[in-house]
């Protein structure tokens, strides 16, 4: 009779993480008598996966009933596969011996690779806000996937970006991998409502890529533009001076009125008007009593936006004997009246 052979028909198999892996093994003869054992790897550090005769292997079940006398199928099923289970599995026939069984024949081995889904991509932006026309970097990370092949794309408001660099680690084979990508994005004044999207496609996702997003509202700072104007009011001796603070983001803003360099009033922006592009407008006004001063007065609207250095716009009120003849930029003998924001 021909000598027993151990047949492992599958050179390699691929299994999704969390599923079960079936490792096939048959023998061609019932002789010699002796058990089967399964190992992962070979060499001095090989790992026992299943022993037919003894031991507790909670994740391993046999496909056939090994207690049947004529059984020649020693296939096993390993449940709840993780990337750490990847490797080459050997079905080894032992010959009955005393006191120990003796290794007799080995199968050729089955290489198990594990497919694992990538984690949801996490997109993070810069720690500090940046202003339009500046380039900022966004990072995207996803972990725990296998096999190594993966595709990552960046989008801004649906438009694919091209300025990015991606690394998959480790460089060589591993039980699982991580991807890290950095994209450069040029900010514009219209980006308050914009989104940056990182999209990851992998064989385990069956054509339904994972996405991570970052809102540019958390990254952008749009500095305000200031305009100071005056309009006469019905009372002859009063002028209404307004400071229009336009197109700023985020909302955090403090405004100070100065009269000839001296602080007159400070207020924090509260009731704001939102523009379509997500930026805000605000207006503060002063009623100026023109009868109290003989000299010209410089009025300054000073704005501190989002903790940045203050910006200001000044307006000269010129003293004149004929207040009704003043142009829109001057008024005689100013004095600051009690005024409130709109």
């Amino acid at each position: 009779e021909e000598e027993l052979q151990v047949i492992q028909p599958d050179k390699s198999i691929s299994v999704a993480a969390g599923e079960s892996a079936t490792l096939h093994c048959t023998v061609t003869s019932l002789i010699p008598v002796g058990p089967i054992q399964w190992f992962r790897g070979a060499g001095p550090g090989r790992e026992l996966i299943y022993n037919q005769k003894e031991g507790h292997f909670p994740r391993v079940t046999t496909v056939s009933d090994l207690t049947k006398r004529n059984n020649m199928d020693f296939s096993i099923r390993i449940s709840n596969i993780t990337p750490a289970d990847a490797g080459t599995y050997y079905c080894v026939k032992f010959r009955k011996g005393s006191p120990d069984h003796v290794e007799f024949k080995s199968g050729a081995g089955t290489e198990l690779s594990v497919r694992a889904k990538p984690s949801a991509p996490v997109v993070s932006g810069p720690a500090a806000r940046a202003t339009p026309q500046h380039t900022v970097s966004f990072t995207c990370e996803s972990h725990g996937f296998s096999p190594r092949d993966i595709t990552l794309k960046w989008f801004k408001n649906g438009n694919e970006l091209s300025d990015f660099q991606t690394n998959v680690d480790p460089a060589g084979d591993s039980v699982s991998y991580s991807i890290h990508s950095t994209a450069k994005v040029v900010l514009t004044r219209e980006d308050v409502h914009s989104q940056v999207i990182c999209e990851v496609a992998h064989v385990t996702l069956q054509g339904d890529p994972l996405r991570g997003t970052a809102n540019l509202s958390e990254t952008i700072r749009v500095p305000p533009t200031l305009e100071v104007t005056q309009q006469p009011v019905r009372a002859e001796n009063q002028v209404n001076v307004t400071c229009q603070v336009r197109k700023f983001y985020p909302q955090r803003l403090q405004l100070t009125w100065l009269e000839n360099g001296n602080v007159s009033r400070t207020e924090t922006a509260s009731t704001l008007t939102e523009n379509k592009d997500g930026t805000y407008n605000w207006m503060s006004w002063l009623l100026v009593n023109v009868s109290a001063h003989r000299d010209d007065v410089k009025l300054t609207c000073q704005v501190e936006h989002d903790g940045q250095p203050a910006v200001s716009k000044s307006h000269d009120l010129k003293v004149s004997a004929h207040p009704k003849e003043q142009g829109s930029n001057t008024a005689p003998g100013p004095a600051l009246a009690s005024a409130a924001p709109l």
Partner: antibody
Framework: QIQLVQSGPELKKPGETVKISCRAS????????MSWVKQAPGKGLRWMGW????????TCADDFKGRFAFSLETSATTAYLQIHNLTNEDTATYFC????????????????WGQGTLVTVSA | IVMTQSQKFMSTTIRDRVSITCKAS??????VAWYQQKSGQSPKLLIY???NRYTGVPDRFTGSGSGTDFTLTISNMQSEDLADYFC?????????FGSGTKLAIK
């Protein structure tokens, strides 16, 4: 196809140091362990030890502890053998040899070998 | 573990059947491989797990044995088979090779 290409022959004086490279291609470098094997002229093969290319951890056979070091440059898919304080007995051909098993935690047999690097130590 | 190849040289003829033996100093199960090495070349794997023929190796090469006694058989000797043959155990550290058997034509 899978290839292991070693650096060229070296002529060294006793007491010097030699560093041999083994550049791997055709497979993913960090999946498979790399062993080093010595063959003195007209002699048999001696396993010197191996390096786990994933973790970078190396194991030296007792006879090769002390003057022998294994290292990696993963980005260049290259393994290195360095021998310090060379003696005449180090004159040999040194082979790198790749393990058959992905994610193996010990070497076994060697399906792939470099072409060998002859190191000659002579005063 | 010492792997002993007692025959340093073996004379053979083309189409002959040749058996090269290797003895382990202790039980190594079937953790044995066989290599062929031609002059000036690196070793080439023939057999692993004592009896499994490696991919692409002609079927005239057969391995057998377990425990301590192992044999590599060439059933139909060819001129290209003239080489040195080494056994190797990988049952325990350090991995060890036999001293080799050189096949030559009678």
């Amino acid at each position: 196809q899978i290839q292991l290409v070693q650096s060229g022959p070296e002529l060294k004086k006793p007491g010097e140091t030699v560093k041999i490279s083994c550049r791997a291609s055709g497979y993913t470098f960090t999946t498979y362990g790399m062993s080093w094997v010595k063959q003195a002229p007209g002699k048999g093969l001696r396993w010197m030890g191996w390096i786990n290319t994933y973790s970078g951890v190396s194991t030296c056979a007792d006879d090769f502890k002390g003057r022998f070091a294994f290292s990696l440059e993963t980005s260049a898919t290259t393994a290195y053998l360095q021998i310090h304080n060379l003696t005449n007995e180090d004159t040999a051909t040194y082979f790198c040899a790749r393990d058959p098993h992905s994610y193996g935690n010990s070497p076994a047999w060697f399906p792939y070998w470099g072409q060998g690097t002859l190191v000659t130590v002579s005063a | 573990i010492v792997m002993t190849q007692s025959q340093k040289f073996m004379s053979t003829t083309i189409r002959d059947r040749v058996s090269i033996t290797c003895k382990a100093s202790q039980n190594v199960g079937i953790s044995v491989a066989w290599y062929q090495q031609k002059s000036g070349q690196s070793p080439k794997l023939l057999i692993y797990s004592a009896s499994n023929r490696y991919t692409g190796v002609p079927d005239r090469f057969t391995g057998s044995g377990s425990g301590t006694d192992f044999t590599l058989t060439i059933s139909n000797m060819q001129s290209e088979d003239l080489a040195d043959y080494f056994c190797q155990q990988y049952s325990s550290y350090p991995l060890t090779f036999g001293s080799g058997t050189k096949l030559a034509i009678k």
